[in-house]
Interface confidence: low
């Protein structure tokens, strides 16, 4: 249904508190290093000119896409070419190439401080003096940093932290209540930033096809009652609402996604026995809660997958027909029947089955040529299989720290020109994979960890693309989207790769080490490890260990000492004496 | 996007005869074997009968076996059941579905059997 006004529509469907903080998200994710004063000032602008429209749809600009008025105002900013350079030259194209040319300079890893949680009793009263603001700059300070996230989903932890403020604020111990919500807060965010990152890029590197199949996938294990019909006008409705996220149309996004929430409590009977406590919660929380709904149970006696898909006489002529469906058809009968598969495993026995029936239904006996093609799964099935028993038996082994250790010298030596903050960010959210997945029984152990595998290695992805420095991560990351992890899996040792020289700079410490969190020590000691792996891509581990447990004993020595930088300086060099001569350096 | 409407419910005494239609859209009908499946009031989905592609070859769970009979026009895109002989516990929403599935459909069509 076409509207005279989009933005006017979009304000009403969306009420102003949401459509205000949607355009702060979009401007935001466009223009990351802006302030937060030009973001809220151009944000107040755009929703005075859609009250005009509201009030009246054929005032003056009020027919304007909203790429032409939101990229119009984008293009205001005086010193756009000053802070972005190339980015400024977007602003001379025509929409819908202006648009795209902002998203194409959409930065994964921008150049921005840290953030510093201040003490408890300044936020509390920042928050207390003007919550609005508290609020806005929340959403603006993640945004910028997380140019990809799903926008309506961060207003659902825009409420949360609303909530913990307004809740804590007035405890009795205000840091114990406040504080471990903040931490749960900040990890489901970092989480939830990179799904929708791999979301985005499966949709503009690999196409709709390619996320449509993985959407047919999950649903269908989600849903395994629901009808294909079902799953596929799902999948559709899906797809819309993160094509409009992910190309940063944020308002439709959130009024889709809205839209597709109420259909599926509409319809739940026909979905899902488990949506229920989801859709008696408000919009937000609803969404959420449908996006993580557990599995629903499988139908009972289900037929074999053989007869429809190996046995009927009708294979052929149902795949000549319509490949897209037929292929759907088999991915959601495989799905709902596997839950205990990953989905990039499932979308690698579609691909298995498309490749025979191209082969087989070309051939003079396509039935005889296609009619073992369920054999060719099993080695698919056990080689993830294979690989997550033997990692769970080494996280158990390790712990935690020790297993993101391993994963570090390991990924090091497969991708040493990877850059050492990126090859440490990586490793260590593989290594959460252990305590994220090892624990589930069998029947969970491979959705939750391949998939998760699949998530993080789309960080390293993007990372690595914004400044290419490996043609074997390139090969990994662009060739197949659903053989990422068994590509980066196969990589062996790079014997290419000429070692880094040795900086004694690299090694040096200080006192300032003692006064960090367990977890920036700990990235500390892992900088230092990978550093070492590039300077000796052939140590072997229990070179590394034994380095690695004389650094410890350094830091720790260190830290009790009174004067700690003396010791620190003194120390050091005698320890990177010894780590030389140990690795023969 | 797949569409499936059933329709040709409705209230009938038991010995009577009901013939429910589904109107299939959004994919190449006549390249899919297609199913009818039922839900009883607080039962789960119970598979009805099935039909392949061409029309030939047609099944039927045991329950309705002799009463029931499957049927369908490719050219006009559209599945039918012909149900004889309907008893009280044929009483159901009646879907039809893709494939041989026993999972149901979206709207469904009701058929009551009472007297």
């Known amino acids: 249904d076409a509207h005279k006004s989009e933005v006017a529509h979009r304000f009403k469907d969306l009420g102003e508190e949401n459509f205000k903080a949607l355009v702060l998200i979009a401007f935001a994710q466009y223009l990351q290093q802006c302030p937060f004063e030009d973001h809220v000032k151009l944000v107040n602008e755009v929703t005075e000119f859609a009250k005009t429209c509201v009030a009246d749809e054929s005032a003056e600009n009020c027919d304007k896409s909203l790429h032409t008025l939101f990229g119009d105002k984008l293009c205001t900013v005086a010193t756009l070419r000053e802070t972005y350079g190339e980015m400024a030259d977007c602003c001379a194209k025509q929409e819908p190439e202006r648009n795209e040319c902002f998203l194409q300079h959409k930065d994964d890893n921008p150049n921005l401080p840290r953030l510093v949680r201040p003490e408890v009793d300044v936020m509390c009263t920042a928050f207390h003096d003007n919550e609005e603001t508290f609020l806005k700059k929340y959403l603006y300070e993640i945004a910028r940093r997380h140019p990809y996230f799903y926008a309506p989903e961060l207003l659902f932890f825009a409420k949360r932290y609303k909530a913990a403020f307004t809740e804590c604020c007035q405890a009795a111990d205000k840091a114990a209540c406040l504080l471990p919500k903040l931490d749960e807060l900040r990890d489901e965010g970092k989480a939830s930033s990179a799904k929708q990152r791999l979301k985005c890029a499966s949709l503009q590197k690999f196409g709709e096809r390619a996320f449509k199949a993985w959407a047919v996938a999950r649903l269908s294990q989600r849903f395994p009652k629901a009808e294909f019909a079902e799953v596929s006008k799902l999948v559709t409705d899906l797809t819309k609402v993160h094509t409009e996220c992910c190309h940063g149309d944020l308002l439709e996004c959130a009024d889709d996604r809205a839209d597709l929430a109420k259909y599926i409590c509409e319809n739940q009977d026909s979905i899902s026995s488990k949506l229920k406590e989801c859709c008696e919660k408000p919009l937000l929380e609803k969404s959420h809660c449908i996006a993580e709904v557990e599995n629903d149970e499988m139908p009972a006696d289900l037929p074999s997958l053989a007869a429809d898909f190996v046995e009927s006489k009708d294979v052929c002529k149902n795949y000549a027909e319509a490949k897209d469906v037929f292929l759907g058809m088999f991915l959601y009968e495989y799905a709902r029947r596997h839950p205990d598969y990953s989905v990039v495993l499932l979308l690698r026995l579609a691909k298995t089955y498309e490749t025979t029936l191209e082969k087989c239904c070309a051939a003079a006996d396509p039935h005889e040529c296609y009619a073992k093609v369920f054999d060719e799964f099993k080695p698919l099935v056990e080689e993830p299989q294979n690989l997550i028993k033997q990692n769970c038996e080494l996280f158990e082994q390790l712990g935690e720290y020790k297993f993101q250790n391993a994963l570090l010298v390991r990924y090091t030596k497969k991708v040493p020109q990877v850059s050492t903050p990126t090859l440490v960010e990586v490793s260590r959210n593989l290594g959460k994979v252990g305590s994220k997945c090892c624990k589930h029984p069998e029947a969970k152990r491979m959705p939750c960890a391949e998939d998760y595998l699949s998530v993080v290695l789309n960080q390293l992805c993007v990372l690595h693309e914004k400044t290419p420095v490996s043609d074997r991560v390139t090969k990994c990351c662009t060739e197949s989207l659903v053989n990422r992890r068994p590509c980066f899996s196969a990589l062996e040792v790079d014997e290419t790769y000429v070692p880094k020289e040795f900086n004694a700079e690299t090694f040096t410490f200080h006192a300032d080490i003692c006064t960090l969190s367990e977890k920036e020590r700990q990235i500390k000691k892992q900088t230092a490890l990978v550093e070492l792996v590039k300077h000796k891509p052939k140590a072997t581990k229990e070179q590394l260990k034994a380095v690695m447990d004389d650094f410890a004993a350094f830091v720790e020595k260190c830290c009790k000492a009174d004067d700690k930088e003396t010791c620190f300086a003194e120390e050091g060099k005698k320890l990177v004496a010894a780590s030389q001569a140990a690795l023969g350096l | 996007e797949v569409q499936l409407v059933e329709s040709g419910g409705g209230l009938v005494q038991p010995g009577g005869s009901l013939r429910l239609s589904c109107a299939a859209s959004g994919f190449t009908f006549g390249s899919f074997g297609m199913s009818w499946v039922r839900q009883a009031p607080g039962k789960g989905p119970e598979w009805v009968s099935a039909i392949d592609s061409g029309g030939a070859d047609t099944r039927y769970a045991e329950s309705v076996k002799g009463r029931f009979t499957i049927s369908r026009d490719n050219a006009k895109k559209t599945l039918y059941l012909q149900m004889n002989s309907l008893k009280p516990e044929d009483t159901a929403v009646y879907y039809c579905?893709?494939?041989?599935?026993?999972?149901?459909g979206s709207q469904g069509t009701q058929v009551t059997v009472s007297s």
């Open positions: 579905t893709i494939g041989r599935s026993a999972s149901r």
